[in-house]
Interface confidence: low
């Protein structure tokens, strides 16, 4: 049993049938010694007298708040929340594992540039009863401080019969160099409890690893005279890093057809124009990557050719 | 991602052109490793992240761009302790800051060539024959130590009479490589900087 | 949990051959990278490596003991174990086998068994 | 063999103060150097690899330094559970080699 924050307790079980469970000992946090009672959620069938009350928690219906009362008035709380590992493996039923990049994978991490800030995301098909907490490090022997928002719905879809709900959480590194050589991953911490089931999900990455960059901006273009070419160009993003001399981007230009079928045509630079034959309704898009360290494509910036 | 490889202008930064083929080289030969040691731990998330030339070299440091040198978190631990003259820029724009720079680059291709020299002669050694360093990449870290051009006394390779276990030098290669493609990474982006101002 | 157990006689003779086996649980010699090390400290004295094995049978001895030494596994049972011939009395010593994991240190030690060499 | 020399042999330091112990190596071993800790009658229990990781579990006032042949262990604010003695080892090359250890006592 270990305290998740005042008051409230997380009790680790192993989950198996006919399972002995955990014996847990609760103290009211009083300094009265007699008369002293303790009933669990919004029952008053009174469990036990004392002081103390020893519970053997087995299963959900042992779990959530035990209040102890002197004489019709409260005297403490302690809310009971489980843990369940099954076969040596902790319980992760409250999120979705997203499959991207690779399988469990429940926190999913992106950063638009190497400020040190970052957005992380999960998906669950629960919608009520459920709080998340979130905390984040640089390291973890010696963690070094990132501050995080409160996690917020940022998204709801319907996905064949089911609606699923997507919450996400902004981190911002307390001291963070852009130029910097990560040694130490960023890890970030999700606490996740719904109704009296407590989860953990974790995630370890370095911010170069989970770079991308907006869209390029200011896509324009410029036809050729007396030619089916045109002039594409762009600017960088404003969230990219600065200097761009330093930061430099690499870029993406593709001519796409209106049938999804028709061949693409794809130029790679690291100029911010480029010269294209432009197609009778096709459009022309841009997309930017770190030119030094490949993480991730941006989204496409697109235009119409007409 | 197969880019076509530009060729740099005479007049441009002459270690603009061999940073971008130290970049090249040291990331298809961490691609080689990750893929001939796959039941190794050799990617990013297994291996222990180590710098071979922390607290010799301060690249990152001295090779800051102006504009962030107004970060308080970037300026934790600037030094100037290379004073020397390198002949990748134009003298009359060599300052004080880019010589300290170009010499801590140079430090860092120097101890990196020794450590991938020594650990090459072990692989060598290896019965199993799984792994060799890419002769590309050693003449391409020789190229950019010759172009930036500082004087400096040759490190001997160390030798060892012990047998050496191929296993661990197997994982302190994969170490090593990502390391040096981490600072492949910066040297190009203060190439691509200087080249720029 | 990862635990390692040592066990084998406490007194040898000289001349005899020791042999000592490490019961392990919580890993597996199947996985790549992982290995066991044997490991003797003489009564006061400091540490001395003697064996390690690897997942793929690969072997490491202390060339000053390598006539003497024959370290193998049995990966179903999760065992290793160590032969040392022709023991001494200068051989008496904690006899320790150790896990040696991906960090390429000596990370999980067993309690270690006492060997004494006496006639 | 690669020779590991610890220095001092024994070392008195008072409480919350600091206690630093190095080991030089007969040859350079690149950042290859584990140190652990053993109290009587237990087996040692590993504190640092790679010259300056610190272990799962190991207090933050232990650190490790230190790169080619010669590394240091520090201990930044001694405690009463620190009493022990300290080993340095290499495995850079086989054989693995420790140091002779170095015996960290209350003043």
């Known amino acids: 049993i270990w305290e998740l924050k005042k008051d409230v307790y997380v009790v680790e079980l192993d989950w198996y049938p006919d399972a002995p469970g955990e014996m847990v000992v609760l103290t009211c946090d009083t300094p009265e010694e007699d008369g002293i009672t303790w009933t669990l959620d919004q029952s008053s069938e009174v469990l036990g007298s004392g002081k103390t009350l020893t519970i053997q928690v087995k299963e959900f219906g042992d779990a959530g708040q035990y209040t102890c009362h002197k004489g019709g008035e409260v005297l403490s709380h302690s809310l009971l929340l489980l843990h369940k590992k099954e076969d040596g493996i902790w319980s992760t039923d409250i999120l979705k594992d997203q499959k991207e990049p690779k399988n469990k994978t429940f926190l999913r991490c992106e950063a638009k540039n190497y400020s040190g800030r970052f957005t992380c995301w999960w998906l669950t098909t629960i919608s009520t009863d459920l709080t998340f907490s979130v905390k984040s490090s640089r390291g973890s022997s010696d963690p070094q401080g990132v501050t995080c928002g409160a996690a917020t719905l940022s998204a709801e879809r319907v996905r064949g019969d089911n609606k699923e709900y997507e919450y996400s959480v902004e981190c911002q590194e307390d001291s963070a160099c852009p130029a910097a050589e990560e040694s130490l991953p960023i890890e970030v911490m999700v606490d996740a409890v719904h109704k009296l089931k407590y989860e953990n999900y974790t995630s370890s990455f370095f911010i170069r690893d989970i770079i991308k960059p907006d869209p390029p901006k200011n896509l324009q273009l410029k036809p050729l005279k007396n030619s089916r070419q045109v002039e594409v160009s762009w600017e960088y993003p404003d969230t990219w890093s600065t200097p761009h001399s330093y930061f430099s981007l690499t870029f993406c230009v593709q001519v796409q057809g209106k049938s999804k079928r028709e061949k693409k045509d794809r130029v790679f630079t690291d100029k911010t124009s480029a010269t294209v034959i432009c197609r009778k309704n096709a459009s022309i898009s841009v997309r930017a990557q770190d030119r030094y360290y490949s993480s991730s494509w941006s989204e496409w910036a697109s235009v119409p050719c007409s | 991602r197969n880019l076509p490889v530009a060729t740099p202008d005479p007049g441009m930064f002459p270690c603009l052109h061999h940073s971008q083929n130290l970049l090249r080289a040291v990331s298809n030969m961490l691609q080689k490793a990750r893929q001939t040691l796959e039941f190794y731990p050799c990617t990013s998330e297994e291996i222990d992240h180590e710098d071979i030339t922390k607290d010799k070299t301060s690249t990152v440091e001295a090779c800051l761009p102006l504009e962030l040198t107004k970060n308080e978190s970037c300026l934790n631990s600037r030094e100037t302790s290379f004073i020397t003259n390198g002949s990748c820029l134009a003298s009359r724009k060599t300052s004080f800051m880019m010589a300290l720079c170009l010499s801590s680059i140079y430090e860092d291709l120097k101890m990196y060539q020794v450590e991938f020299k020594t650990m090459n002669a072990k692989l060598l050694m290896d019965p199993k024959r799984q792994i060799f360093l890419d002769q590309n990449m050693l003449a391409v870290i020789d190229e950019l130590m010759q172009a930036l051009n500082f004087n400096s006394e040759t490190v001997p390779q160390k030798s060892s009479l012990e047998e050496p276990d191929f296993y661990k030098t197997k994982i302190k290669l994969c170490i090593l490589l990502h390391a040096f493609r981490i600072r492949a990474v910066t040297i190009d982006r203060v190439m691509s900087y200087l080249n720029a101002s | 949990e990862v635990t390692l157990r040592e066990s084998g006689p406490a007194l040898v003779k000289p001349t005899q051959t020791l042999t000592l086996t490490c019961t392990f649980s919580?890993?597996?010699?199947?996985?790549?990278?992982?290995?066991v090390s044997w490991i003797r400290q003489p009564p006061g004295k400091a540490l001395e490596w003697l064996a390690h094995i690897y997942w793929d049978d690969d072997k490491y001895y202390n060339p000053s003991l390598k006539s003497r030494l024959t370290i193998s596994k049995d990966t179903s049972k999760n065992q290793v174990v160590l032969t040392m011939t022709n023991m001494d009395p200068v051989d008496t010593a904690t006899y320790y086998c150790?896990?040696?994991?991906?960090?390429?240190?000596?990370?999980?030690w067993g309690q270690g068994t006492t060997v004494t060499v006496s006639s | 063999d690669i020779v590991m020399t610890q220095s001092p042999d024994s070392l008195a330091v008072s409480l919350g103060e600091r206690a630093t112990i190095n080991c030089k190596a007969s040859?350079?071993?690149?950042?290859?150097v584990a140190w652990y800790q053993q109290k009587p009658g237990q087996p040692p229990k590993l504190l640092i690899y790679y010259a300056s990781n610190r272990y799962t579990g190991v207090p933050d006032r232990f650190s490790g330094s230190g790169y080619g042949t010669d590394f240091t262990l520090t201990i930044s604010s001694l405690q009463a559970e620190d009493v022990a003695v300290y080993y340095c080892q290499q495995d850079y090359n086989s054989p693995w080699t420790f140091g002779g250890g170095t015996k960290v006592e209350i003043k």
């Open positions: 150790t896990r040696r994991g991906i960090r390429s240190a000596m990370d999980y």
């Open positions: 919580g890993f597996s010699l199947r996985k790549s990278v992982m290995g």
């Open positions: 040859q350079s071993v690149s950042n290859d």
